[in-house]
């Protein structure tokens, strides 16, 4: 009876996500058969989050909208380890929007999920950010410095990275 009600709960939770994510990839968390963590297929997973590389070329606003209709946000990078994971799936000749912007052009950077912007956990390329008209952040590869962040005009179409919390069922 307990297992039956657990299954029913799982199915209703899966139905919630079905509109945008018809297929989920789930893994068992720890040793308890009842705890599964899932990411939409073909998203990748790292720690408690799922990531999707969007290859459509869109402005920052539309990239964020694209993530939001999938139940996600443009990526918020919290640690070097998280960035190191993300870059494994990126192409060196492309740039990708992050969920980081400076709407007023006053160098008050803010993350889309309201995570406080911490100067000590940023990975700007040297000399960046460097232009008050460039109010959105991308991650890209520079041969001299490898992967890092750069400010860019928000209307320039780029690829993007979406991030959402893992789905626990």
């Amino acid at each position: 009876n307990f297992m039956y009600s657990k299954t029913v709960k799982r199915l209703s939770k899966l139905r919630e996500y079905q509109q945008y994510h018809p297929s989920l990839t789930c893994v068992m968390e720890g040793k308890d058969i009842e705890d599964w963590s899932c990411c939409p297929t073909p998203w990748t997973s790292f720690q408690s989050s799922c990531y999707f590389i969007s290859t459509g070329m869109q402005s920052w606003t539309k990239s964020q909208k694209n993530c939001s209709v999938m139940g996600a946000d443009l990526v918020v990078i919290n640690t070097r380890e998280e960035q190191d994971f993300i870059i494994q799936n990126l192409k060196r000749n492309s740039s990708y929007f992050l969920g980081l912007s400076d709407p007023g052009g006053r160098r008050h950077w803010q993350w889309v999920d309201q995570t406080p912007y911490n100067e000590n956990v940023t990975f700007w390329h040297s000399g960046e950010p460097n232009n008050l008209d460039e109010r959105c952040a991308i991650i890209n590869f520079r041969s001299s410095e490898e992967w890092g962040w750069n400010d860019i005009h928000c209307h320039v179409p780029q690829k993007s990275i979406c991030k959402m919390k893992k789905i626990y069922i």
Epitope: G56, M57, Q58, S59, T61, K62, K65, N66, V69, N131, D133, E134, I152, H153, H155, V156, P157
Partner: antibody, heavy 118, light 107 residues
Amino acid sequence: QVQLVQSGAEVKKPGASVKVSCKASGYTFTSYLIHWVRQAPGQGLEWMGTIYPGGGDTSYNQKFKGRVTMTRDTSTSTVYMELSSLRSEDTAVYYCARMGDNEYFDYWGQGTLVTVSS
Amino acid sequence: DIQMTQSPSSLSASVGDRVTITCRASGNIHNYLAWYQQKPGKAPKLLLYDAETLAIGVPSRFSGSGSGTDYTLTISSLQPEDFATYYCQHFWSTPYTFGGGTKVEIK
């Protein structure tokens, strides 16, 4: 007032290149993207690509990739669109357009007719 | 790439008529749609953006509606200066494709 003034009509032979200019005035040139759109005689409109004059970043329609190059000269507030390996199907009026704050084309140049003929 | 299908390709109408032009996208463009008016030998002129927002200086007889993949431009009472070709264009992702155009002619 915002103005985009384009260079004059051109006649080119197949295989040649053409470079069309678009001089901006009446606003901060480096703050707004410039897009290029073309229109073949009696036909519809086709988006070619865009350039950000501040940093020089570009994004091209895949259809033209490898043939189109967009550049800018901030000292003269001018954007250039060069199309190479011209063929007769490239005969068209080429327009530059500014993308406004709302992310739509709010101002357009007057157009430049490029004729490709042997 | 998102394709834009505009209909009709042409129509004949009289001054005072109500005119409706439709535009269908091959995918959801989330209201990122513009409508333009073009007269012979001239550059297109922005009429509406975000599917329904009137551009500055555009008469209120022009209106737009729609969502998802289907959008409409309506001219409530056609004026002599409205005889022109109308285009829709999406701005969801590149390439920012246009519809094929609708030529509004005098009946």
